[in-house]
């Protein structure tokens, strides 16, 4: 299953697969997700360690038990890759690293004023995988404000050195977010030219095309077909570069079929993993495990529950089957790829969907009235699971907030349905940034179902906490998917890294604002808390979050939103937006309906409605 | 020029049968699975069934599975579809087509189709 | 097996008409998705395949996009020769599987 604690001072030894210079422990665990057989990693930040060759060393691990010894190394971080964690597996790292330099192929260099410029440039730019800026106070006058785009062989910083007023990042290309636009289409019968840079068996272009996107410098593919020329060469998926970022030349050629990588389309990229089955196709690789099971599908799903199997064949040959079971053969590859595809056999074959990150219908979980004022605009995909909660009676307007916690599933606030607790009246819009960009064309969803807690009474700020089941599932994407819910009662966890975000007010008196906005505030206790609110009880089951000195709170819009904090690099839905003294007013904090405390009726109500457990654990 | 051309089509009782063949040229028909494909009169279209490049692997639809049958004979480049217990329900415009992309991306080339009628 | 669906299932429209077909699929087939014109006596003629590729020799008029569960045939400016039944069909699982056809008549 899915793993997602880190241990820190704890660094696993042996199993190396592959090594690299990452920026943080994040990351690093990033590139062990979408490694074929990393399951473990160590990273050795700086301050760990003294040999300047090992610092920001990432170390990608495998084990055929999925586990390895640890043994104590002060500083070090070590984690689970993330296969198998559904939603939580992207390639988008937003973070820029203050004080670091990147190192590699430094290729384009420019003024611009910000650092935020230097990433959107990155971005934009077909090659570039990093970056590093030089700010105003940089010590050398002529390299202030430069703008460094850079690549590498792996895509990784071939070396990563601290470097006062320097900040470095990664393209946000994997996010989905490069302005650059992408080629869909395919070209039958027509191969490409230039730098080959890597080399995998797939059984068709479709898969060939998503292997691309995912490949750190791959920028078109040649595709040769399982009825090319030449037998050695059937089914070869060439991934390919060149200096221009297009193909040099194109050439006329019977059986092949080539195209270009997705990861410059904008909002939407295809998820790394490969769900088509392939009937009457073998795939050859290691063999891991061979299992009797009942159908291509089950066979499918064995392969994906047991983490280092990437493919699989089905086989429906007489001596392979007794009874209705059938043999299935759990496989895997140094590359992930098959090493061998066979056509017009009695077998079916595909691959593992360990990293689809559709993931399971469920909530998430791990086990470890009111807009924001002062804060700041948000950008795409920065806040996925955040959603409008609009009602369309004769106009149509935003009410409240939401967070998506799984396909079918937005936990809101109960005071949202006060006087409406109609079910067709409310439109869920999802996946969006600006509320102007929704027009009468823009998809939305329907509520199947309100529920509201059973001991919520209108206007008493207890127990503000209402789920809504959706008609239809929501797909995940980059900008749509869902929050972890914090584990029940979660007490011990401090938590530091908390944003409020909403469409509301921007003031006491204010409308409702245009961009989703976002702003970072500080948990206050409950007994500082209740020092504020003489007049109301604030117990245990909320959770309040403001500015002494106030300027910075949720407002009218707000409601029903997220308070989300970042612990051990993953966001947690702490808090449900709830109520306050106006906004932004000094010594009058925010409060929240506190998550934690409601978890067993998250699990209670989210199971029960359609009767089969709906919770997933990554931890 | 790649061509498919369907015949045996025809009118047969319920409970009788009909083997449909499908001839081809202009192509290296051993290299490319077959499929049939029919369509009843001013209906859409229906997968019936495909064969692989060899013969070695056949798949069909549920509507006709255990009653026809999908095989090919590369040395005649010839493809046929063995009909029996034949229901009304069968009625339709027969074609065989192929996808010669190697790449699951659509049948490329059809025959003219052959009508099939079941009727007492 | 996976259901295609098609809306509309007839349309009236005039040459020069832009024309929008569209084609839902009951659950994900990222690209695998094709679009074919049959005409009354003909046999079907594909016309995009991998949701939108255009199959050579077909005019440029015709464009297809979507991927996932929604998909759309577009012809940018409808010419007499495109009066025809349009199908979707979906090459992504076992079987393959047809939408209803989408009929487009002389206004």
């Known amino acids: 299953g899915c793993l997602t604690q880190l241990y820190e001072n704890a660094f696993f030894r042996g199993g190396d697969v592959a090594s690299m210079y990452t920026p943080n422990a994040q990351y690093c665990q990033m590139r062990c997700t979408f490694h074929p057989r990393c399951l473990l990693f160590s990273f050795l930040p700086a301050s760990s360690i003294n040999d300047m060759e090992k610092r920001f060393g990432c170390f990608l691990k495998d084990s055929v038990t999925g586990t390895l010894p640890k043994v104590h190394r002060t500083g070090a971080v070590s984690g689970h890759s993330l296969k198998q964690c559904g939603h939580q597996i992207s390639a988008c790292h937003r973070d820029i690293y203050k004080g670091v330099d990147m190192r590699g192929v430094n290729f384009n260099v420019s003024k611009v004023s910000s650092v935020e410029e230097c990433q959107k440039r990155c971005t934009s730019n077909i090659r570039c995988q990093f970056f590093s800026y030089a700010t105003q106070t940089f010590h050398k006058a002529e390299y202030r404000n430069n703008c460094l785009l850079k690549y590498s062989p792996g895509g990784t910083p071939t070396a990563i050195k601290v470097l006062s007023n320097v900040e470095s990042g990664f393209s946000l290309k994997p996010c989905a977010l490069s302005e650059i636009g992408c080629h869909m289409n395919i070209f039958q019968h027509l191969a490409f030219s230039d730098v080959d840079v890597a080399r995998v068996l797939t059984p068709d272009a479709f898969v060939c095309r998503t292997i691309c996107t995912y490949h750190p410098n791959c920028l078109f593919f040649t595709f040769y077909t399982n009825v090319w020329k030449i037998e050695s060469q059937r089914n070869v998926c060439l991934l390919k570069t060149s200096e221009s970022g297009t193909p040099s030349s194109s050439t006329p050629q019977e059986n092949t079929i080539s195209g270009y990588s997705l990861l410059t389309c904008k909002r939407t990229l295809p998820e790394p993993c490969h769900s088509k089955i392939y009937p009457g196709v073998d795939f050859g690789g290691e063999e891991l495990n061979v299992t009797f099971v009942k159908g291509v599908n089950v066979c499918q799903e064995t392969c994906t529950k047991m983490i280092r199997c990437q493919f699989f064949t089905y086989s429906l040959l007489p001596e392979d089957c007794k009874e209705e079971k059938c043999k299935c053969f759990l496989r895997l590859s140094m590359d992930g790829s098959p090493t061998r595809i066979a056509y017009g056999t009695q077998g079916s074959s595909g691959y593992s969907l360990r990293l689809c990150n559709t993931g399971d219908n469920s909530v998430c979980t791990t086990k470890t009235s009111t807009r924001i004022v002062g804060g700041t605009n948000s950008s795409w995909g920065e806040w996925p699971w955040q959603v409008s909660l609009q009602v369309k009676l004769t106009a149509q307007r935003h009410l409240c907030g939401g967070s998506l916690i799984g396909h079918q599933w937005v936990l809101t606030a109960a005071h949202c349905f006060d006087g409406l607790p109609l079910q067709d009246v409310w439109r869920i819009y999802s996946g969006i940034l600006n509320l102007s960009d929704i027009t009468k064309d823009t998809p939305f969803s329907q509520i199947k179902e309100i529920i509201i807690h059973q001991n919520y009474k209108v206007s008493e700020g207890n127990h503000d906490i209402a789920l809504i089941k959706l008609q239809a599932p929501l797909n995940y994407t980059e900008f749509q998917k869902p929050i972890c819910l914090p584990s029940k009662g979660d007490t011990s966890t401090i938590y530091t890294n908390c944003w409020v975000t909403g469409w509301g007010f921007s003031k006491e008196k204010g409308e409702i604002q245009n961009i989703l906005q976002k702003v970072n505030i500080p948990l206050v206790t409950n007994e500082e808390c209740q020092k504020r609110y003489q007049d109301y009880k604030i117990t245990q089951r909320m959770v309040c979050a403001g500015y002494k000195e106030g300027g910075k709170d949720a407002c009218k819009g707000d409601s029903g939103g997220p308070l989300v904090c970042k612990h051990n690099g993953m966001w947690r839905l702490v808090g449900i937006t709830s109520w306050g003294e106006g906004c932004a007013r000094r010594e009058q904090p925010g409060v929240y309906t506190k998550v934690a405390e409601y978890m067993d009726w998250i699990l209670e109500k989210t199971q029960s409605s359609d009767g089969k457990a709906q919770m997933q654990s990554p931890a | 020029e790649v061509q498919l051309l369907e015949s045996g089509g025809g009118l047969v009782q319920p409970g009788g049968s009909l083997r449909l063949s499908c001839a081809a040229s202009?192509?290296?028909?051993?290299?490319?699975?077959m499929d049939w494909v029919r369509q009843a009169p001013g209906k859409g279209l229906e997968w019936v069934s495909s064969i692989s490049s060899s013969g070695g692997w056949t798949n069909y639809a549920d509507s006709v599975k255990g009653r026809f049958t999908i095989s090919r004979d590369n040395s005649k480049n010839t493809l046929y579809l063995q009909m029996n217990s034949l229901r009304a329900e069968d009625t339709a415009v027969y074609y065989c087509?192929?996808?010669?992309?190697?790449?699951?991306?659509?049948?490329?080339?059809w025959g003219q189709g052959t009508l099939v009628t079941v009727s007492s | 097996d996976i259901q295609m669906t098609q809306s509309p299932s007839s349309l009236s429209a005039s040459v020069g008409d832009r024309v929008t077909i569209t084609c839902r699929a009951s659950q994900s087939i990222s690209s695998y998705l094709n679009w074919y014109q049959q005409k009354p006596g003909k046999a079907p003629k594909l016309l995009i395949y991998a949701a939108s590729s255009l199959q050579s020799g077909v005019p440029s008029r015709f464009s297809g996009s979507g991927s996932g569960t929604d998909f759309t045939l577009t012809i940018s400016s409808l010419q007499p020769e495109d009066f025809a039944t349009y199908y979707c069909q979906q090459s992504y699982s076992t079987p393959p599987t047809f939408g209803g056809g989408t009929k487009v008549e002389i206004k």
């Open positions: 087509a192929t996808d010669t992309s190697g790449s699951y991306l659509g049948f490329d080339y």
């Open positions: 202009g192509f290296t028909f051993s290299n490319y699975p």
